[in-house]
């Protein structure tokens, strides 16, 4: 906490610029206008403040905003944005994509901090759900975000939105979260055609139940191997040598390489020893 | 509910062979979904699977130790059976038989039997 | 072999703390990775299974994450009951393995 002093004579701040620099902490608290910084905020990031006089701008708008920041100041926080904390940002009401835009570039390059998750939890919350837009830009900046989503968070995602999501979007999601967003994926891209189709849905069908692999495999999809080993277990041990055969098709020799692994292993185990014969590709069931 | 009950001699000389059955209550070892594991533990020690099996015959075994592991099904008694061929003083651990839920994972152990391999 | 490191072997926590204790497998297991909690004379109890589902009955301080190599086991308030053994387990492959084991001791 700085101490509250006088300001001396001629330094009185008249606009935020470069001068500023040379200011001593209990000058900057003595002499720049809380008001005159939050109107002039854009160009704070212009100037190269230390740390610790950062610390003093951040004083002086905690003590003009008692109840939080108004979107105004948010918006040009800039690198001001890492002296927050969750708690400061708690108290803030975001509703501009841009703004959150303008927050999340300060953050650019770096893992998710508490700050940013906070950010984007309220952004979230704001608006009652994850829309399009805001899902594009936040997997943008992280492409992990969606799976970073409880199941619950997952169930406000509407349908539209997916189609702003990637299949890196969906490397680190388990299957609860897959479980959510399948039923989504299918609605949206419920009107492509076959092949179409299959493309978008395909990094989504790690929560698909059998009766949807089972059509999939009257439709010469080719799934790929990658693709299969992400199938949930009950959704593959119901299904025919026969319908694995259709669902894979030119891939279907990928099965020996993946035998001792899960759901493959899960799957031959409980197939009979004729059936899986007729592959020709010696597994043991 | 099921539960799961190991039985067989506690101690064992060394180079003779280890004999241990598990026996299936409430429930069928014949389970379409479910495969029945061997764990053992040594005295202060860790958890190390030995292998599994399924009521059709197959099994799996612990790369480590399946020149000597046998595991077997008894549909007719609903039970699994374990057999380590030559023993030695490092096979002396708590044996443990259990069910693994494709779906989940090991959810029903027994509550486990010390065999010692002593002379 | 696929390998499964856990992280601590030992902590020593209070009632009321979070604890988290992380599991690495040596290749991908996808999410089939198991947590079990065993007390002294006891058979291990399933915690998790399939990396963040919550086995039936078991408390919902209780929580997993990850998927690939990288997996946690969090109690997000310790209690009485939770001063146990730790094991994690990968069922991916057909060797099925367990980590080493953390043991949650009381500060």
């Known amino acids: 906490e700085v101490e509250k002093t006088a300001c001396p004579s001629g330094k009185k701040a008249r606009e935020i610029d470069e001068s500023l620099i040379f200011y001593k902490k209990w000058e900057l608290e003595a002499c720049v206008d809380a008001a005159l910084l939050a109107t002039q905020m854009d160009r704070v990031n212009a100037i190269p403040f230390t740390y610790e006089q950062l610390d003093v701008l951040k004083h002086k708008l905690d003590e003009l905003y008692p109840q939080g920041y108004p979107e105004s100041v948010i918006q040009h926080l800039g690198y001001l944005f890492l002296k927050m904390s969750p708690e400061d940002i708690r108290k803030w009401n975001v509703t501009s994509l841009e703004t959150l835009k303008a927050l999340l570039e300060v953050n650019k390059g770096h893992e998710m901090s508490p700050q940013v998750a906070t950010l984007i939890d309220r952004f979230v919350k704001g608006r009652g759900q994850l829309d399009k837009d805001t899902l594009d830009t936040l997997t943008a900046f992280y492409p992990g975000y969606l799976c970073s989503l409880s199941p619950e968070e997952l169930s406000s995602v509407p349908p539209s939105s997916i189609w702003a999501v990637r299949p890196q979007d969906l490397d680190t999601c388990d299957p609860r979260q897959l479980d959510v967003l399948y039923p989504k994926a299918r609605l949206a891209f419920q009107n492509m055609n076959g092949s179409e189709y299959f493309v978008k849905i395909q990094s989504f069908l790690g929560g698909a139940p059998t009766e949807d692999l089972k059509a999939l495999s009257q439709q010469n999809v080719s799934m790929d191997l990658a693709t299969f080993m992400k199938l949930r277990t009950d959704a593959v041990l119901p299904l025919t040598v026969a319908e694995v055969q259709k669902l894979l098709g030119p891939h279907v020799e990928g099965l020996k390489a993946e035998e001792r692994h899960r759901p493959v292993r899960d799957w031959i185990l409980r197939q009979r020893q004729d059936d899986l014969d007729t592959l020709g590709l010696g597994l043991q069931g | 509910q099921v539960q799961l009950q190991e039985s067989g001699p506690g101690l064992v000389k060394p180079s003779e062979t280890l004999s241990l059955t598990c026996t299936v209550s409430?429930?069928?070892?014949?389970?379409?979904?479910?495969?029945w594991s061997w764990i053992r533990q040594p005295p202060g020690k860790g958890l190390e699977w030995i292998g599994y099996i399924y009521y059709s015959g197959s099994t799996n075994y612990n790369p480590s130790l399946k020149s000597r592991v046998t595991i077997s099904v008894d549909t007719s008694k609903n039970q699994f059976s374990l057999k380590l061929s030559s023993v030695t003083a490092a096979d002396t651990a708590v044996y443990y038989c259990?069910?693994?839920?494709?779906?989940?994972?090991?959810?029903?152990w027994g509550q486990g039997t010390m065999v010692t391999v002593s002379s | 072999d696929i390998q499964m490191t856990q992280s601590p072997s030992s902590l020593s926590a209070s009632v009321g703390d979070r604890v988290t204790i992380t599991c690495r497998a040596s290749?991908?297991?996808?999410?089939?990775l198991n947590w079990y909690q065993q007390k002294p004379g006891k058979a291990p109890k399933l915690l998790i299974y399939?990396?963040?589902s919550l086995q039936s009955g078991v408390p919902s301080r209780f929580s997993g994450s990850g998927s690939g190599t990288d997996f946690t086991l969090t109690i997000s308030s310790l209690q009485p009951e939770d001063f146990a053994t730790y094991y994690c387990?990968?069922?991916?492959?057909?060797?099925?393995?367990f980590g080493g084991g953390t043991k949650v001791e009381i500060k």
């Open positions: 387990q990968q069922s991916y492959d057909a060797s099925y393995t």
């Open positions: 290749q991908s297991i996808s999410s089939y």
């Open positions: 399939a990396a963040s």
């Open positions: 259990a069910r693994e839920d494709a779906l989940t994972g090991f959810d029903i």
């Open positions: 409430g429930g069928s070892v014949s389970s379409y979904h479910d495969l």
